[in-house]
């Protein structure tokens, strides 16, 4: 992807950092549009979309990493991430079958919009990047493993089981950036300060 | 197959009240946003309501023009839409027409409303 | 309110030929996703039709004669070759935000 240009500013840097890793928490830009359009806005089928236990680094994880590593693992694991989207997307209803089906666009278009937002988070990930080489305290590379593997769905039998996959896949997710969101308000007020 | 069936109009006196039903049959009524639509005679068309399914709370929207006189509502396990129309003023003198979802793919044969002294 | 101007508001094209209807939307009617616009065909004493859905959707059952282009603000409806039974009204409709809105129409006559 065509990287944009730099903000040199930290401080303007890491307020676009949180304010994006702020709506990517929020399950009502993707979890709950996908629930919707997938039929299991049903309580029963609710409970089985927990994530996976270590489809995602833990919080734990990623405080442990040095800020470097922490935007390594998560440029990493948004990668995986933008791959299973585009899985998703595939199995998504088309603007054809909308109307057949009564489903909400707005819904559709929240989950094809979830791509062009996580590109735009990873352009100021390299961004942050940057700047903090360009900082002039060094700080031990300390890169995490990722996401374990990539999330990859388990052989599902049926397209059911495909749908709660992914359900699965996008409560992760939200947890994940909700984790990502609580270590950035942690970064310190310059590239060579952190508050721990 | 998909059948939109409006009744309910008729003349009315100024700033009476008349009462618009929608029969819909062909399809998971209960899925479905539905909105109410008009044209005055010889002229355009206007979009008057709108109400949500139940996975949307049945949210409901209105024109300008018709807000807190018109309400939009909905009984899924009849498969029925209704306008109710309070304090009807001449303007409001058009065919209705019940119609599904965000862009209208089926419409009914509509019910005409002439409000007139 | 998004207002919808259509033109012209009248036109007549000669069997075979190509009829051209623009529609300019007051702000956008697009997103980076959809296109939300919709164009409907009327014959007197009938509801509207949908032909177009989305700007450039064929909507199931239409001919292919009918074809929609177009976004932001700038749409359009080609009917190529026209037919005699093309005589009619049409109107473009959005539904980008509420309240939907739709143009004044455009009245299409077959020379």
């Known amino acids: 992807a065509a990287i944009g240009s730099c903000s040199k500013e930290y401080r303007v840097l890491l307020g676009q950092l949180q304010k994006q890793t702020d709506l990517m928490q929020d399950t009502s830009r993707l979890l709950d549009p996908y629930i919707r359009i997938q039929g299991l806005d049903v309580p029963k089928l609710r409970e089985h979309c927990r994530e996976r236990p270590g489809a995602f680094p833990s919080e734990e994880t990623l405080r442990g990493l040095g800020r470097r590593g922490f935007l390594q693992t998560l440029n990493a694991t948004l990668g995986c991430v933008l791959h299973r989207l585009a899985d998703l997307e595939q199995r998504l209803p088309k603007a054809q079958d909308l109307e057949r089906s009564g489903l909400n666009i707005e819904d559709l278009e929240k989950l094809q919009m979830a791509r062009p937002n996580i590109l735009g988070l990873r352009n100021n990930i390299y961004c942050m990047a940057q700047l903090l080489d360009n900082s002039d305290t060094a700080e031990p590379t300390k890169a995490g493993r990722g996401a374990s593997q990539p999330p990859t769905p388990t052989p599902a039998s049926d397209a059911f089981q495909r749908k709660l996959e992914g359900c699965r896949f996008l409560h992760g997710y939200h947890r994940f950036m909700h984790s990502v969101g609580r270590v950035f308000s942690k970064w310190g007020e310059s590239p060579n300060r952190s508050r721990r | 197959e998909v059948q939109l069936q409006e009744s309910g109009g008729g003349l009315v006196q100024p700033k009476g009240s008349l009462k618009l039903s929608c029969a819909a049959s062909g399809f998971t009524f209960n899925t479905y946003a539905m909105n109410w639509v008009r044209q005055a005679p010889g002229k355009g068309l206007e979009w008057v309501a709108r109400i949500r399914s139940k996975s949307d709370n049945y949210a409901t929207y209105y024109a300008d023009s018709v807000k807190d006189r018109f309400t939009i509502s909905r009984d899924d396990s009849q498969s029925m839409l209704y306008l109710q129309m309070n304090n009807l003023k001449t303007e409001d003198t058009a065919m209705y027409y019940c119609?599904?979802?965000?862009?209208?793919?089926?419409w009914g044969q509509g019910t005409l409303v002439t409000v007139s002294a | 309110d998004i207002v919808l101007t259509q033109s012209p508001a009248s036109l007549a094209v000669s069997l075979g030929q190509r009829a051209t209807i623009s529609c300019r939307a007051s702000k956008s009617v697009s997103t980076s996703v959809y296109n939300y616009l919709h164009w409907y065909q009327q014959k007197p004493g009938q509801p509207p039709k949908l032909l177009i859905y989305?700007?450039?959707n064929l909507e199931s059952g239409v001919p292919a004669r009918f074809s929609g282009s177009g976004s932001g603000t700038d749409f359009t409806l080609n009917i190529h070759p026209v037919e005699e039974e093309d005589a009619a009204t049409y109107y473009c409709?959005?539904?980008?935000?509420?309240?939907?809105?739709f143009g004044g129409g455009t009245k299409l006559e077959i020379k």
């Open positions: 119609v599904r979802y965000d862009w209208f793919a089926y």
């Open positions: 409709q959005h539904s980008r935000e509420l309240p939907w809105t």
């Open positions: 989305l700007a450039s």
